[in-house]
Interface confidence: low
Amino acid sequence: CSCSSLMDKECVYFCHLDIIWVNTPEHVVPYGLGSPRS
């Protein structure tokens, strides 16, 4: 799917197929957008 802005968190998390995904204990975050939240 085509994304809205990087502010559209749901889209960033579920639609950006070109982002490497990293699993954390709490949630999945897109690596490269910022440090995973603890």
Epitope: S2, S5, L6, M7, D8, K9, C11, L17, L33, R37
Partner: antibody
Framework: QVQLVESGGGVVQPGRSLRLSCAAS????????MHWVRQAPGKGLEWVAV????????YYTDSVKGRFTVSRDNSKYTLYLQMNSLRADDTAVYYC??????????????WGQGTLVTVSS | DVVMTQSPLSLPVALGQPASISCRSS???????????LNWFQQRPGQSPRRLIY???NRDSGVPDRFGGSGSGTDFTLKISRVEAEDVGLYYC?????????FGGGTKVEIK
């Protein structure tokens, strides 16, 4: 009409703190991500930080990570930038700018007038 | 981060004459959705920046049609068809394809 008004700038000594505010009006503040962008005297524009529309996430340029914190109060239509451990190279005009809503890459469609932060002993 | 390089640094131009500013990116700005997220901003003396162009060639509302954007991939251009006195100031390109957003160093347009 969309309006963004920054405040809180001033002269501060190295190592001290300052909190900037950006009062928004003319749009549904809680639907938009918000950025801080700065401009050192005589220099170009540098993106500093961003906060999600709902305040759930924020990201920073490397040079301010661990020192600056962006936050927002959607009920007050206000964006904040808490600046700690200030350094001389943080001296700049700080602008708040709105992110586009549901349009990827639609950054900075509206800007405030800026507030000057001078870090000097 | 993507590096944005603008040229020239300074652009003296006579009133009524055309002006052209170049912007090059260190990586392609074509996103996977096919769009190219390249914006242009104007900063008049003593004022805050104002967005002129988004997605390479789309003018923001209220922007005169003498401003036009073009380009693709890594090479972009802002053209002013006939420079007016109010066009004096700094012009910045900015990419929004890759995170974080990055700006060019700016081009100063002045009247000669």
């Amino acid at each position: 009409q969309v309006q963004l008004v920054e405040s809180g700038g001033g002269v501060v000594q190295p190592g001290r703190s300052l909190r900037l505010s950006c009062a928004a009006s003319g749009f549904t503040f809680g639907s938009y991500g918000m950025h801080w962008v700065r401009q050192a005297p005589g220099k170009g524009l540098e993106w500093v930080a961003v906060i999600w529309y709902d305040g759930s996430d924020e990201y920073y340029t490397d040079s301010v990570k661990g020192r600056f914190t962006v936050s927002r109060d959607n009920s007050k239509y206000t964006l904040y930038l808490q600046m700690n451990s200030l350094r001389a190279d943080d001296t700049a005009v700080y602008y708040c700018a709105r992110d586009g809503y549901r349009t990827r890459g639609n950054y900075f469609d509206y800007w405030g007038q800026g507030t000057l932060v001078t870090v000097s002993s | 981060d993507v590096v944005m390089t603008q040229s020239p640094l300074s652009l003296p131009v006579a009133l009524g004459q055309p002006a052209s500013i170049s912007c090059r990116s260190s990586q392609s700005l074509v996103y996977s959705d096919g769009n190219t997220y390249l914006n242009w901003f104007q900063q008049r003396p003593g004022q805050s920046p104002r967005r002129l162009i988004y997605k390479v060639s789309n003018r923001d509302s209220g922007v005169p049609d003498r401003f036009g954007g073009s380009g693709s991939g890594t090479d972009f251009t802002l053209k002013i068809s006939r420079v007016e006195a109010e066009d004096v100031g700094l012009y910045y390109c900015m990419q929004g394809t890759h995170w974080p957003p990055t700006f060019g160093g700016g081009t100063k347009v002045e009247i000669k």
